[in-house]
């Protein structure tokens, strides 16, 4: 005749938390509570996030839904992943271009604006380490270039131009006299 | 000792409003739940609304619900009922309650009742 | 909504005799081992009072002439030696879930 032993539920645990009256089960990933639950261990009342908001864990208490961030156009910052119901927008920066810090401890939510990679074909140097979360590395000149100052100056062509030594240790067989 | 002295009854036409308030003392009024339970004359107890303690979530029965408003002010021990568009079957005693939680199967009692007020709705 | 059925509706007792009224629930008002229901009295007049909660369990103050028991649905009040002054109108009511639901009340006279 009893009804059923219900499972026991922990207020204090992962998965009830107290809201209002009862222990309600949370809402999960993605959905907003729109209404506790109105028996011990119920389910509360849940609803989708709007379009351009999301929430990002399981919640027990979110009334409402986090606003999608916009990526900072003035700052050249492009969407890599669109925001959804259960993730916020990934800003970044786009191919050829790298994340610059605006502060000094930089952590995955900082502030940061966009800058071209350095094009080290345009500078006649080799690339050593390619452009993503910093600059591009240029390593050493590229075959036909010798360094002097801070560029790759390129081998001359005919007795007419001048060879200082580090020109003539590259760009040696070049060399008529 | 315990005491819930209500007021705020009275004669009001259809689609008219009444605020009902609850005083209370006694106890320490923010650590408890609250409801108030309406009874029509020659009826039988019926629940109205009820307010948590502590984050203040209001439940209504769907006969009043966006109809009533519940709230509390625990800084003056006091509980509200704000019924607006009264109807002529909103007619009854109000009772205000305080409900006390049992143990850890947040189970409530309504384990003190104010007199009760008269609401009238007619025209 | 969990429907309260009293019975009966009026119950005509001699004083000093036993009275007994039942409260059935249309669903289990059962939560974890324990019945989420209690009882009133009402006197004209005066704030009605709890007497019984989690069905078997007497409220302080209220006279061990009182006593609630039952299970699941079937539930029962008894007065084991009715005094003049329990003459009043007693109602069960369940905590089980919202919205919250009284029966409808029985009427307790002294034959």
């Known amino acids: 005749q009893g009804g059923t032993r219900s499972p026991r539920c922990d207020c204090a645990g992962d998965f009830h938390k107290k809201i209002g009256l009862f222990c309600c089960r949370g809402c999960p990933a993605g959905h907003y509570l729109k209404a506790p639950c109105t028996e011990p261990c119920g389910n509360s009342t849940c609803l989708v996030c709007p379009q351009d908001t999301f929430l990002a864990w399981e919640n027990h208490h979110n009334s409402e839904c986090a606003r999608c961030q916009a990526c900072d156009e003035q700052a050249s910052q492009v969407a890599l992943e669109n925001c959804s119901a259960v993730a916020d927008t990934r800003c970044g920066c786009k191919p050829g271009w790298f994340v610059e810090c605006q502060v000094s401890q930089c952590v995955s939510s900082s502030p940061f604006y966009c800058q071209p990679c350095l094009d080290c074909g345009a500078l006649h140097r080799h690339t050593r380490l390619l452009c993503s979360r910093r600059d591009t590395d240029c390593g050493t000149c590229l075959p036909g270039f010798y360094e002097h100052g801070d560029g790759c100056v390129s081998c001359p062509t005919s007795t007419l131009g001048s060879c200082p030594e580090r020109c003539a240790a590259v760009c040696g067989w070049r060399q008529m006299f | 000792q315990m005491q819930l002295v209500q007021s705020g009854g009275g004669l009001v036409k259809p689609g008219g409003s009444l605020r009902l308030s609850c005083a209370a003392s006694?106890?320490?009024?923010?650590?408890?739940?609250m409801s108030w339970i309406r009874q029509a004359p020659g009826k039988g107890l019926e629940w109205v609304s009820t307010?948590?303690?502590?984050?203040?979530?209001?439940y209504f029965p769907d006969s009043v619900k966006d109809r009533f408003t519940i709230s509390r002010d625990n800084a003056k021990n006091s509980l509200y009922l704000q019924m607006n568009s009264l109807r002529a079957e909103d007619t009854a005693v109000y009772y205000c309650?305080?409900?006390?939680?049992?143990?850890?199967?947040?189970?409530?009692?309504?384990?003190?009742w104010g007199r009760g007020t008269l609401v009238t709705v007619s025209s | 909504d969990v429907v309260m059925t009293q019975s009966p509706d009026s119950l005509a007792v001699s004083l000093g005799e036993r009275a007994t009224i039942s409260c059935r629930a249309s669903?289990?008002?059962?939560?974890?081992?324990?019945?989420?229901m209690q009882w009133y009295q009402q006197k004209p007049r005066q704030p009605l009072k709890l007497l019984i909660y989690?069905?078997?369990n007497v409220e302080s103050g209220v006279p061990d002439r009182f006593s609630g028991s039952g299970s699941g649905t079937d539930f029962t009040l008894t007065i084991s030696s009715l005094q003049a002054e329990d003459v009043a109108v007693y109602y069960c009511?369940?905590?089980?879930?919202?919205?919250?639901?009284f029966g409808q009340g029985t009427r307790l006279e002294i034959k």
């Open positions: 307010i948590s303690d502590g984050d203040s979530y209001s």
């Open positions: 006694g106890f320490t009024f923010s650590s408890y739940a």
């Open positions: 009511q369940q905590s089980r879930k919202l919205p919250y639901t």
């Open positions: 309650t305080r409900d006390r939680i049992y143990g850890s199967v947040q189970y409530y009692a309504m384990d003190y």
């Open positions: 989690a069905a078997s």
């Open positions: 669903e289990s008002v059962e939560f974890s081992g324990t019945s989420l």
